[in-house]
């Protein structure tokens, strides 16, 4: 149990203890949510105190202060998803339709996702807000007819499901055109060819 002497400058529990070189002893770190209010000596272990409101320490530490909680900066496109507690800093994420454009240990600046042009859609990512859109072509039998960061390719309409017949096939950028079976085809669409 700390404090105890250490000649090789290492402690038995690296996570919860630290080496104090002045006295050449191992002392307890303070648990998350606390800070060092009195340093250890040969006869007394570290004394810890709880972080004040609006401050935190996330890890076992031997800090003499707690870190100040920072709000998510909406000007930078960030929004809060979990508040600051004594043990954890504020958790932020990019707004929907934005991605993290600047990273310094955590996201500091979000920017609008770029549009995917007609005939493409944004490749789905596991984590929202992590990177800009990567646009991929609609798969066969699907279309997407807008420029948008969020539009998804939709399946072409099946005319027969509606009791209609196909007048023009769908493309990657447009849906199938259907017509009533009783409607006559315009001359340019007619299968009859006069010689």
């Amino acid at each position: 149990v700390p404090p105890y002497g250490s000649e090789n400058q290492t402690c038995r529990d690296q996570e919860k203890e630290y080496y104090e070189p002045r006295h050449r002893i191992c002392c307890s770190r303070c648990p998350p949510g606390t800070y060092v209010s009195a340093k250890c000596s040969r006869s007394r272990d570290t004394v810890c105190a709880t972080c004040a409101e609006n401050s935190y320490n996330e890890h076992w530490n031997y800090l003499t202060i707690c870190q100040l909680c920072r709000p998510c900066d909406p000007v930078m496109g960030l929004e809060e998803i979990a508040p600051c507690t004594s043990k954890r800093k504020t958790q932020c994420r990019c707004q929907p339709g934005m991605f993290c454009a600047a990273w310094a240990l955590e996201c500091t600046h979000c920017e609008l996702l770029s549009d995917c042009p007609p005939g493409t859609e944004a490749e789905l990512k596991d984590e929202v807000g992590k990177g800009n859109n990567h646009c991929v072509p609609c798969k066969a039998g699907h279309f997407q007819n807008t420029s948008s960061p969020s539009a998804r390719c939709q399946p072409h309409t099946r005319c027969e499901d509606q009791g209609l017949v196909e007048a023009a096939p769908g493309t990657a950028q447009s849906d199938t055109t259907c017509r009533n079976p009783s409607e006559s085809l315009p001359p340019e669409m007619s299968g009859t060819m006069l010689m």
Epitope: P74, G77, I81, A82, Q95, P96, G97, M98, P149, S150
Partner: antibody, heavy 114, light 107 residues
Framework: EVQLLESGGGLVQPGGSLRLSCAAS????????MTWVRQAPGKGLEWIGV???????YYTDSVKGRFTMSRDNSKNTLYLQVNSLRAEDTAVYYC????????WGQGTTVTVSS | DIQMTQSPSSLSASVGDRVTITCQAS??????LSWYQQKPGKAPKRLIF???SLESGVPSRFSGSGSGTDFTLTISSLQPEDFATYYC?????????FGGGTKLEIK
């Protein structure tokens, strides 16, 4: 204090349209994403969509192509244009701050009936 | 979409009772869960977010716990003003989804 005030609801025939508004105060509206949620009579809550501070929109499948969200940051106002209304769109429509819907307005009622 | 299953759908209890409502997500949502209280004719009011963080002004008899897929809202000692409908909501995904609601009635 954050306040949201919806308006524009009413009785409309099937196939009809309405434009719902949400006036925001007490926070810097232009910085925040905004969310629309609805609640059919006696039913639970259904997310309609979200619009980010730059105007980018995401919708639930059941309203895609019929509902359009927009915003006027200079007027601190959010809009929901609802077209091709159906009986199942009858609900109280709420706007809420941020994509997490932390603060809600009091709602505006849309009734679709012939 | 992430499905949220809330239970029970209704609950009868008396003033002073301890009440627990549960919510289960169809996939892991970390701690990105809110609890709302809704009274008849009123808008939902957020009580708890990030699974366990109490909104300012919400009485301390309300508490939330859980992470991943299983979450709980507890009211330690029911007060007359607590009889209402309670909803859970996930915001791990931008497309929010809500539990079906729990109607808390006076026994």
């Amino acid at each position: 204090e954050v306040q949201l005030l919806e308006s524009g609801g009413g009785l409309v025939q099937p196939g009809g349209s309405l434009r719902l508004s949400c006036a925001a105060s007490g926070f810097t509206f232009s910085y925040y994403a905004m969310t629309w949620v609805r609640q059919a009579p006696g039913k639970g809550l259904e997310w309609i969509g979200v619009i980010n501070s730059g105007g980018g929109t995401y919708y639930t499948d059941s309203v895609k192509g019929r509902f359009t969200m927009s915003r006027d940051n200079s007027k601190n106002t959010l809009y929901l244009q609802v077209n091709s209304l159906r009986a199942e769109d009858t609900a109280v429509y709420y706007c809420a701050k941020a994509s997490t819907a932390d603060v809600w307005g009091q709602g505006t009622t849309v009734t679709v009936s012939s | 979409d992430i499905q949220m299953t809330q239970s029970p759908s209704s609950l009868s209890a008396s003033v002073g009772d301890r009440v627990t409502i549960t919510c289960q997500a169809s996939q892991g949502i970390s701690n990105y869960l809110s609890w709302y209280q809704q009274k008849p004719g009123k808008a939902p009011k957020r009580l708890i977010f990030a699974a366990s963080s109490l909104e300012s002004g919400v009485p301390s008899r309300f508490s939330g716990s859980g992470s991943g897929t299983d979450f709980t809202l507890t009211i330690s000692s029911l007060q007359p003003e607590d009889f209402a409908t309670y909803y859970c909501q996930q915001y791990n995904s931008y497309s929010l989804t809500f539990g079906g609601g729990t109607k808390l009635e006076i026994k």
